[in-house]
């Protein structure tokens, strides 16, 4: 039922598939970079402007004409902390999710010219300025180099780097994707004296190999080989070092001092999972056992007389979980006080909610400074008087985000800084603080159009609106836009939240087809107050389909009882809860229970496939994009966090009975579209290949699409347009829409 009577009365156009694919209606951002406690940079018409936060006046920091003769397309820029140099990035070549190589040049802002001597080599893997001054550290060919002055020769810090084997200062595939969410494994001390770095050894890590077909003229496909530890396989090993960059010499090689992992880690496989400088000469390291329910924080001090780093056992802090794993995805980072003698950290409390705890480095126990049946999402800033954090406390809505400050001299004095600023338009905030937290930018991302504002911490006064998306607002007035419903259902006395993107002129007395948009991985959240223009907007607006998402057991930000429910049992409760959600939606009266579909990508593709293979009879059809199909095929760090090891002594049985392939027979009852990129370095094409084989083996007719040379994002312009067009046709056919 497309509600044609309503649509006829409303002459406005709908949000079409073309609108989504061509990005007709663009959300405007306001991306600033703080360069001091009162100034930020903002790019406008390719000029770099410097703004005064207090008064809002700006001046041109760098004109767009400066590099007209440069001869390269500049991908990014980075200004040295002392404002004397600008690092220009070009020849960007993507590697994995975060990693890339590029070329770099340095422009002297005083002399207004490019530095031509002692240039950084092409294909550099990572570059970073020191936190003060203008030292540079970079990684090239898996080795680390330091420049004390941009125009002087580099000092080589490491000599052991070897492609796919030894990684100095950069992460290997699994550390990049699952531990640090970054390519960089370098950490400058606050004043730039010391450079800490990790070294990863992948000598024994098995390789994933896949074909890359490249240009049509390539007669033989290239084979890509990546060290990738799958569940239960040999993992990379890690070592940690610190080098003093103030004592580098061109005569002798740099001396890196190793800090070894705690004894409780060295007894077996382990990971380095966090590095945080506490002071100029104190560093904290967090280590995690391969079985990720036990972590240790070491606090290490520099001993000037020996040049070594001492980590006292008395200062070790152990974090463990008896119900699941440590942290949301890994142990949270500590936020140290100025003297480095204490820190604040988000950990699980006794009730299983993640809150801020105050630690003194010499004491084992900590004091919780927040509490409640809600969670702290992140610590955003720490000053001598206040700690600023984002939480989902307000109105008991896990899918909301607000900025709070807590007085450090009296933990009962908590103020919500964002809750009532624009309560209708803005319920989901993130924040960017100036260097010493004197000012902050609030970024509101929904439920209304995004709004960017600037504020002073002195009195929490709003200074000005930076971007209100008013131009987009005007444009969308002429479009029949869907509305978004955020609510919850109660199952077994527990609240579970869902969202629905409802068609324009939604009428609860009518029946609508429903598409369940699923992710459902551990600590995921799909029901929130964020405004989005996406495929669901098109489906609801033009095709009158309700697009729903449900956060069941395993989802995040609502306590460990819900999140740890799927510990060691992926493919069970989170799958069952999506089916139950669809049943509940059917009972609401406005859903056509003969036209319910499900779709998901990655973990969502796995859940979609497990749901369709469950034989529930609830779903007519579904689409799985780049799905996991068997947990032994996915990487060790992610998989083992939730599943343990695939060994008979540990959890092999559940690894084997949580596969999509074992449910092949039930796919005869549904219409299935399976999609995967052939160059997916993350969820390997192997995973869909095995689903396909199992379905063929039992005689299931299904639809499939591969995307040649596409990775996990299927994000190239042509592939992106193709996949969403293809999925739209499939859904329309499934729902018998014209």
């Amino acid at each position: 039922n497309k509600g044609t009577d309503d649509a006829t009365a409303d002459s406005r156009k709908t949000y079409t598939l073309t609108d989504y694919l061509k990005n007709t209606y663009r959300l405007k951002l306001y991306s600033l970079r703080w360069i001091s406690d009162h100034e930020y940079l903002y790019k406008q018409e390719n000029n770099i402007l410097v703004f005064n936060a207090e008064y809002g006046n700006s001046s041109v920091f760098l004109e767009n004409s400066t590099f007209d003769e440069f001869g390269h397309s500049i991908n990014d820029y980075s200004i040295s902390p002392d404002g004397q140099f600008i690092l220009l990035e070009y020849n960007y070549v993507k590697q994995w999710r975060h990693s890339y190589t590029a070329s770099y040049d340095i422009y002297d802002l005083n002399k207004r010219q490019l530095i031509t001597e002692e240039r950084i080599p092409n294909n550099t893997q990572w570059v970073t300025w020191s936190p003060v001054g203008h030292k540079l550290a970079y990684v090239w060919n898996n080795d680390i180099y330091v420049k004390i002055e941009p125009n002087l020769p580099s000092y080589r810090i490491t000599w052991t780097g070897k492609e796919d084997i030894i990684y100095n200062g950069i992460t290997d595939w699994v550390y990049e994707e699952e531990v640090f969410s970054a390519y960089s494994a370098l950490w400058w001390s606050p004043n730039g004296t010391f450079l800490a770095y990790a070294q990863f050894n992948d000598t024994e890590v098995p390789l994933i190999e896949y074909s890359f077909y490249s240009d049509e003229s390539l007669q033989y496909p290239k084979t890509v080989r990546v060290p990738y530890p799958k569940a239960g396989a040999v993992n990379p090993t890690v070592k940690f070092f610190v080098v003093n960059t103030d004592s580098l010499s061109s005569v002798t090689n740099a001396t890196s001092i190793q800090i070894t992992a705690p004894a409780s880690m060295l007894i077996g496989d382990h990971y380095l999972c966090d590095v945080t400088w506490a002071t100029q000469e104190r560093i904290s390291l967090q280590w995690l056992r391969r079985i990720q329910n036990y972590s240790v924080m070491d606090i290490c001090d520099y001993d000037e007389s020996s040049g070594r780093w001492n980590c006292l056992v008395a200062r070790q802090h152990i974090e463990m979980s008896t119900t699941g794993w440590v942290g949301r995805f890994r142990p949270s980072e500590p936020h140290f006080t100025l003297d480095g003698n204490s820190f604040y950290k988000i950990i699980s409390n006794e009730e299983g909610y993640r809150h801020i705890c105050y630690f003194q480095i010499d004491k084992k126990d900590c004091t919780f400074i927040t509490k409640g049946t809600w969670e702290v999402i992140g610590i955003e800033a720490l000053t001598s008087d206040y700690l600023y954090y984002i939480s989902n406390e307000y109105k008991g809505m896990p899918g909301g985000r607000n900025l709070y400050k807590i007085q450090l001299s009296d933990y009962t004095k908590v103020t919500c800084l964002s809750c009532e600023l624009n309560p209708e338009r803005c319920q989901y905030y993130s924040v960017s603080f100036s260097k010493e937290a004197k000012y902050y930018q609030l970024r509101c991302s929904g439920p209304g159009l995004p709004l960017y504002t600037l504020h002073s911490s002195v009195n929490d006064k709003g200074l000005r609106v930076l971007e209100d998306n008013s131009a987009l607002d005007k444009m969308l007035q002429n479009v029949q836009m869907p509305s978004k419903k955020l609510d919850f259902i109660i199952l077994n006395e527990t609240k579970f939240w869902y969202q629905m993107i409802l068609p324009p002129h939604f009428d609860k007395s009518k029946k609508y087809p429903l598409l369940l948009d699923v992710y459902a991985g551990p600590c995921s959240q799909k029901a929130d107050t964020v405004f989005r223009l996406n495929w669901a907007t098109y489906l609801a607006s033009t095709e009158n389909i309700i697009v729903a998402s449900f956060d069941g057991r395993g989802s995040g930000y609502q306590g460990d009882k819900i999140m740890h429910a799927i510990n060691r049992r992926l493919g069970t409760f989170e799958v069952e809860d999506q089916i139950e959600a669809a049943r509940q939606f059917s009972k609401m009266g406005f859903v056509d229970n003969k036209r319910i579909a499900i779709w998901g990508w990655s973990y969502g593709g796995y859940v979609t496939s497990m749901v369709l293979g469950s034989g529930s009879g609830v779903f007519k059809c579904g689409i799985a994009v780049a799905p996991v199909s068997r947990w032994e095929y996915y990487d060790s760090v992610y998989t083992e966090r939730y599943m343990g090891l695939p060994t008979p002594e540990d959890n092999l049985d559940h690894y084997r009975n949580s596969t999509v392939m074992s449910r092949a027979e039930n796919f005869k009852q549904v219409e299935y579209l399976l999609i995967h990129g052939t160059a997916d370095d993350n969820v390997h094409f192997q995973q869909s290949a095995q689903i396909s084989k199992a379905l063929v083996d039992v005689g299931v007719d299904f639809q499939a699409m591969w995307y040649t040379d596409e990775d996990h994002g299927i994000a190239s312009s042509t592939a992106h347009q193709h996949i969403y067009t293809h999925m739209s046709h499939f859904i329309k056919q499934c729902f018998s829409l014209p």
């Epitope: 109105k395 008991g396 809505m397 009532e420 624009n422 309560p423 209708e424 338009r425 439920p447 209304g448 159009l449 007035q477 836009m481 509305s483 978004k484 419903k485 955020l486 609510d487 919850f488 109660i490 609240k495 107050t529």
Partner: antibody, heavy 120, light 106 residues
Framework: EVQLQESGAELVKPGASVKLSCKAS????????INWVRQRPEQGLEWIGW????????KYNEKFKGKATLTTDKSSSTAYMQLSRLTSEDSAVYFC?????????????WGAGTTVTVSS | QIVLTQSPAIMSASPGEKVTITCSAS?????MNWFQQKPGTSPKLWIY???NLASGVPARFSGSGSGTSYSLTISRMEAEDAATYYC?????????FGGGTKLEIK
């Protein structure tokens, strides 16, 4: 079915206080704001304030601070509004209304209203 | 506080006639909600988030606007549409309502 049932009409003397009730049914009471709105005879609507039963937090229109006090009893899913130091100006129909979270939200369910008459 | 001014305060329309009620805000608001109230009853949600019709509201109603200027339109007036209509904002505290537009049938 989601419903808000308000208490019966009140005739009170000037200077006295009155406590109005609003009993919720058909939904999870603790999870939605209850708002109170005043409508004087032949006049428009004025928002008094809201209370969030989940944690008891409140927000008042400055105009009604000291005049209205909002409370809830979660065990009986009932919201209350106490009006103090009543004058003839307070004679009105008082509505309770639920604020729902759909996109930016709105008052989706209203009580039938309680008529308060202040007279000596 | 944000003052909402509705116009006209009172109007009458013939069946089939197009009706537009405007609501002007003293400063910019993000969304406008509209309520219908008939004598002796509580207000009913009619249009939410500027342009979305509440459940059961006939398709002849529509809402539009942004910033400080919003409107409710009836494409073809019917007898059952005779009522008082209020606009309401919650973009900043306190929540405020317009003074109401009384719509009568000719």
């Amino acid at each position: 079915e989601v419903q808000l049932q308000e208490s019966g009409a009140e005739l009170v003397k000037p200077g006295a206080s009155v406590k109005l009730s609003c009993k919720a049914s058909g939904y999870t009471f603790r999870s939605y704001d209850i708002n109170w709105v005043r409508q004087r005879p032949e006049q428009g609507l004025e928002w008094i304030g809201w209370i969030f039963p989940g944690d008891g937090s409140t927000k008042y229109n400055e105009k009604f601070k000291g005049k209205a006090t909002l409370t809830t009893d979660k065990s009986s899913s009932t919201a209350y509004m106490q009006l103090s130091r009543l004058t003839s100006e307070d004679s009105a129909v008082y509505f309770c209304a639920r604020w729902t979270v759909v996109g930016p939200g709105y008052f989706d369910v209203w009580g039938a209203g309680t008529t308060v008459t202040v007279s000596s | 506080q944000i003052v909402l001014t509705q116009s006209p305060a009172i109007m009458s329309a013939s069946p089939g006639e197009k009706v537009t009620i405007t609501c002007s805000a003293s400063s910019s608001v993000s969304y406008m909600n509209w309520f219908q109230q008939k004598p002796g009853t509580s207000p009913k949600l009619w249009i939410y988030s500027t342009s979305n019709l509440a459940s059961g509201v006939p398709a002849r109603f529509s809402g539009s606007g942004s910033g400080t200027s919003y409107s409710l339109t009836i494409s073809r007036m019917e007898a059952e549409d005779a009522a008082t209509y209020y606009c309401q904002q919650r973009s900043s505290y306190p929540n405020t309502f317009g003074g109401g537009t009384k719509l009568e049938i000719k």
